[in-house]
Amino acid sequence: AVDLTLLANLRLTDPQRFFLTCVSGEAGAGRGSDAWGPPLLLEKDDRIVRTPPGPPLRLARNGSHQVTLRGFSKPSDLVGVFSCVGGAGARRTRVIYVHNSPGAHLLPDKVTHTVNKGDTAVLSARVHKEKQTDVIWKSNGSYFYTLDWHEAQDGRFLLQLPNVQPPSSGIYSATYLEASPLGSAFFRLIVRGCGAGRWGPGCTKECPGCLHGGVCHDHDGECVCPPGFTGTRCEQACREGRFGQSCQEQCPGISGCRGLTFCLPDPYGCSCGSGWRGSQCQEACAPGHFGADCRLQCQCQNGGTCDRFSGCVCPSGWHGVHCEKSDRIPQILNMASELEFNLETMPRINCAAAGNPFPVRGSIELRKPDGTVLLSTKAIVEPEKTTAEFEVPRLVLADSGFWECRVSTSGGQDSRRFKVNVKVPPVPLAAPRLLTKQSRQLVVSPLVSFSGDGPISTVRLHYRPQDSTMDWSTIVVDPSENVTLMNLRPKTGYSVRVQLSRPGEGGEGAWGPPTLMTTDCPEPLLQPWLEGWHVEGTDRLRVSWSLPLVPGPLVGDGFLLRLWDGTRGQERRENVSSPQARTALLTGLTPGTHYQLDVQLYHCTLLGPASPPAHVLLPPSGPPAPRHLHAQALSDSEIQLTWKHPEALPGPISKYVVEVQVAGGAGDPLWIDVDRPEETSTIIRGLNASTRYLFRMRASIQGLGDWSNTVEESTLGNGLQAEGPVQESRAAEEGLDQ
C-alpha cells in the first residue's frame, strides 16, 4: 500500500489551532514539478457534508512529502470530510478523514467501520443532545433510512446493514429531523472487496494474517498496518511516537501522538495512534491493553509485561507476541519484511536463524508463493546465528507475493513470511522528442511515457548514424533534463533510442522505439560583396557579385538577394538557386524607389553573412508607348519610320529611343535617340540592302517609357553594304513633301 498518512489534531479548544497534515513516505512524493511524482493534495470535500462558506483554508507545503491545512475559523469549519491524495499513477491513493462536531446532537460510537464483503455492519449513533424527532440516516448525502425517536436502544440509534457489498462503502450520517446537518453523527464504512482473510481478483488468495490490528488489502494482499506498527504482517512495533510504514515519521509536539487521529489508506481507515484511545485520542490505554485505539490485549505469559505502545515486553529467554516462545525454539532473525527484485533476475536471498540446538544449513528452507521449496546453496555459521543463502531461479511475475523462510530443529520451528515484489523494468512507449538541431548537435527530450515499473533511476540515450553498423554511442542522463548530443556530423540522420532503468540488478529495460533525427547543414561562412549593378529599366535591375576565393568545395546551395524598400517598409527576396551564379536580373521592382541591396550565401536553411549593403535608386516610370508606328523603305539603305505621340503624357517628352534589329539576327539590337521630341517621323540610314529589319520605339520623360509595337520592313535591293544605320528625322509633313 502507499505510505500515506493523514493526521488530524483533535485538541479542539480552539478551532484556529486545528490542523490536518498529510505525510507521504513515498520516494519523491509531492514534488509535482517533474513528471515522476504528482503533488500531494489535501482538501475539504464538500460534496456530501456542506458547511456554510467561510474564509478559504490555507495550504502549506513542508518539504516534498508533507502538506498541512490550517485556517479554520469556527467549529463548523471542521465538520465534514477531508481527503489527502498521494502516490503516482496506478498507486494514486486517497486517504479520508471524517470529522464530527463534539457538540453534535448525535455522536458516532466508532467513526470508521472496516468490514468484509458479506458481513453485517452496525453503525451506532449515541444520543448526545436528545430531540424527540425522527432520526434520518443518509448514505453519501442521500436519504437511506428513518428511525422513529422511540427506536433508540440504550441511548443509541443503530443502523444495521446486512450482507454489505463494496458499493455500500461511503460516508453515512445520522441526523435528527429538523436539525442542522452539522449536528449529525458522521461515519465511514469501508467494505473490503473480499470475504475475511482473502484477497485478489477472485478473492482466491489468502491474506498473510495481519497482526496488531493490521488490515489485509483486498487488491494486493499487503497488510495496512496501524500507526505505530511495521513489517509485512505488522509484527513489529515502532518506538513510541513514531509512525509510517518504516516508522520513519515522528509525531509532532512534546506529548507524542496524544490527541492525533491517524487515517491510512483503505481498507484501514482511521484510528488513534498506538497507546491512545477515546473520541479525541487523549486517553491512555487501560492496563493490559495496547495498540491503536487500545484495541489489543497483551495477555503476556512467562513474566512478560504489557507496554501500551508495543505489547508484551518479554524477559530474557522468551519471545513471541505473548512471550509464549522459549528462546530454545529456533527463531528467524532480522528478516526484511519486503524485498524487491527485477523480472528475470536470479537474486540471492539470505535467511538467518538462531536457536538451540543450533540451526544448520539443511534445517533452513525457502518457500515460494506457488509452494516450491528452495534449499540453501551455502550457509555461513557464526557463533550467534546461521545464515542460509538461497540462489533463486530466474524470477517471473508470478513469483510476486508472500515467500516464507522456515527453520526446523528438534527444538521446534519458526517461520517468517516476507513480501517479494517482482518489478518489470521500464520500457519506453515512445521515441524521444527532438527539441532543436544544429549542424553538429541535437537537443533531445528523453522524458517519455513507459510501461513497466518505476521509479526511473537512469535514462540512457543510444544514438548512431542512420543505416550505420557501427556501435551505438550511449549517454547517461538525468531523467528530468534535456540532453544535448554533441560532436555529430552535419546533414546526417541519426537513429536515437531511449533506454530506462529502475533500481536494482537487472533493472535495465528494453530499448524504446527508434526515431530519426537529422543534423542541420554546416553554416555557410563566406561573405559575398556586390561587384556592381545597373538599371535596365524603371523596374529592372541587374546585379553582380563575387565571393572570396578559398580552397576546397564551396559550402552553399545558392544566393539570397534582399532588397529593402525603406519607404514602404517592404522586403523583396530573390532566390538564386545556383552556387555558381554571380549575376541576377531583378524584375518587377517599383520605379522611382530607393532600395537597399545585399546578397548572402545560403546552405540548406542556413544563411551566411550578408554582403555590405548597396543603395540603388530606380528611375521613375516613363511615359506610355508611341502609337501607330509604321515603317516604309525609301531606298536600299534607308527606311522611314512614322508614329503618333503617346496619349495622356505626364509631362513633356525629352526624346524618343528607336530600337533597330535585323530580323532573325543573333546580335544585340541598336538603340538610336531621336533628340527632337516634337518630331513624328525619322529616317534610318546606313542600312543593308535587301535586308529585313525590326523596329520599335519608346519615349522618355524622366525615365524610359513602354515600347511601342514592333514593325518590320525590308530595304530595297542591290545596293552596296552600308556601314550601319544612322538616323535623320524631320516632321512627317516635311518628309511627305519631299
Epitope: K138, Y143, Y145, T146, L147, E151, E178, A179, P181
Partner: antibody
Framework: EVQLLESGGGLVQPGGSLRLSCAAS????????MFWVRQAPGKGLEWVSR????????YYADSVKGRFTISRDNSKNTLYLQMNSLRAEDTAVYYC????????????????WGQGTLVTVSS | QYELTQPASVSGSPGQSITISCTGS?????????VSWYQHHPGKAPKLMLY???NRPSGVSNRFSGSKSGNTASLTISGLQAEDEADYYC??????????FGGGTKLTVL
C-alpha cells in the same frame, strides 16, 4: 423507475371494512417511511397515517385513530391500510406516498405518489 | 377545515406570472422552513414541485419559484403555460410531527 400502485378501493356501507394495498417497485422499499394521504371529493389533501421502515412505529391522523391500521410487508414490497368502522366522511381517493429527505434538507417530503384508489362509503 | 389557507382559484394568460399564497401559523409555516408545493392534475399522481420553501427537485422547471414571509408562503409560476393548469397544494411540517395541507388552488390558464 419508482412506482406505487394502489388497489382495494370500492363501495362499502357505513360501518364496513376495506383493506387497501400499495405495491411498490423501483426502490429499496424497506428503507423508506410510507404514508397514506386522502382527498375527499372537491376537497384538499389530508394525511391519514404513516409507518416507519421497520414497521414497528405507526402514527395516525385524529380523524382515523382507532379505526384504521397501517402495516407493511417489506419482503413483498407492499404497504397496507386496514379501514374498519367506515364512515361517509371517509369517502375519498386514497393515495400511498413515499417520503424522502432531500440533500441539504432537514425534513421529509412526499417525492413519489401513486395514482390513488377511490373508496366510497355509502348506504 | 384545512390548517393552511389557499385561494380557491387563480387564473392567468399564457406568458404571464401568477402567485398562489398559503397562510398558516407559527406552529407550521412560520415556525419551519419545511414548506412544500405539489401539483395535481386530476386523475394523476400529485407531483412535488418545491421543497424547503424554495428548492426545486431535479426535473422541475425553473419557472416555478417559492418564497416565505412570516406565516405566508407563496408559489410563483412565471411564463405561464397551458400544461401548468392543475390544482396546487401547499404543505408544511408541524410542531406536532404531522403534516398539514392547504385546501388547494385551482389554476386556470386562460
Amino acid at each position: 423507475e419508482v412506482q406505487l400502485l394502489e388497489s382495494g378501493g370500492g363501495l362499502v356501507q357505513p360501518g364496513g371494512s376495506l383493506r387497501l394495498s400499495c405495491a411498490a417497485s423501483g426502490f429499496t422499499f424497506s428503507s423508506y417511511m410510507m404514508f397514506w394521504v386522502r382527498q375527499a371529493p372537491g376537497k384538499g389533501l389530508e394525511w391519514v397515517s404513516r409507518i416507519y421502515p421497520s414497521g414497528g412505529w405507526t402514527y395516525y391522523a385524529d380523524s382515523v385513530k382507532g379505526r384504521f391500521t397501517i402495516s407493511r410487508d417489506n419482503s413483498k414490497n407492499t404497504l397496507y391500510l386496514q379501514m374498519n368502522s367506515l364512515r361517509a366522511e371517509d369517502t375519498a381517493v386514497y393515495y400511498c406516498a413515499r417520503v424522502t429527505v432531500p440533500l441539504d434538507s432537514g425534513s421529509y417530503y412526499f417525492d413519489y405518489w401513486g395514482q390513488g384508489t377511490l373508496v366510497t362509503v355509502s348506504s | 377545515q384545512y390548517e393552511l389557507t389557499q385561494p380557491a382559484s387563480v387564473s392567468g394568460s399564457p406568458g404571464q406570472s401568477i402567485t398562489i399564497s398559503c397562510t398558516g401559523s407559527s406552529s407550521d409555516v412560520s415556525g419551519y422552513n419545511y414548506v412544500s408545493w405539489y401539483q395535481h392534475h386530476p386523475g394523476k399522481a400529485p407531483k412535488l414541485m418545491l421543497y424547503d420553501v424554495s428548492n426545486r427537485p431535479s426535473g422541475v422547471s425553473n419557472r416555478f419559484s417559492g418564497s416565505k414571509s412570516g406565516n405566508t408562503a407563496s408559489l410563483t409560476i412565471s411564463g405561464l403555460q397551458a400544461e401548468d393548469e392543475a390544482d396546487y397544494y401547499c404543505s408544511s411540517y408541524t410542531s406536532s410531527s404531522t403534516w398539514v395541507f392547504g385546501g388547494g388552488t385551482k389554476l386556470t390558464v386562460l
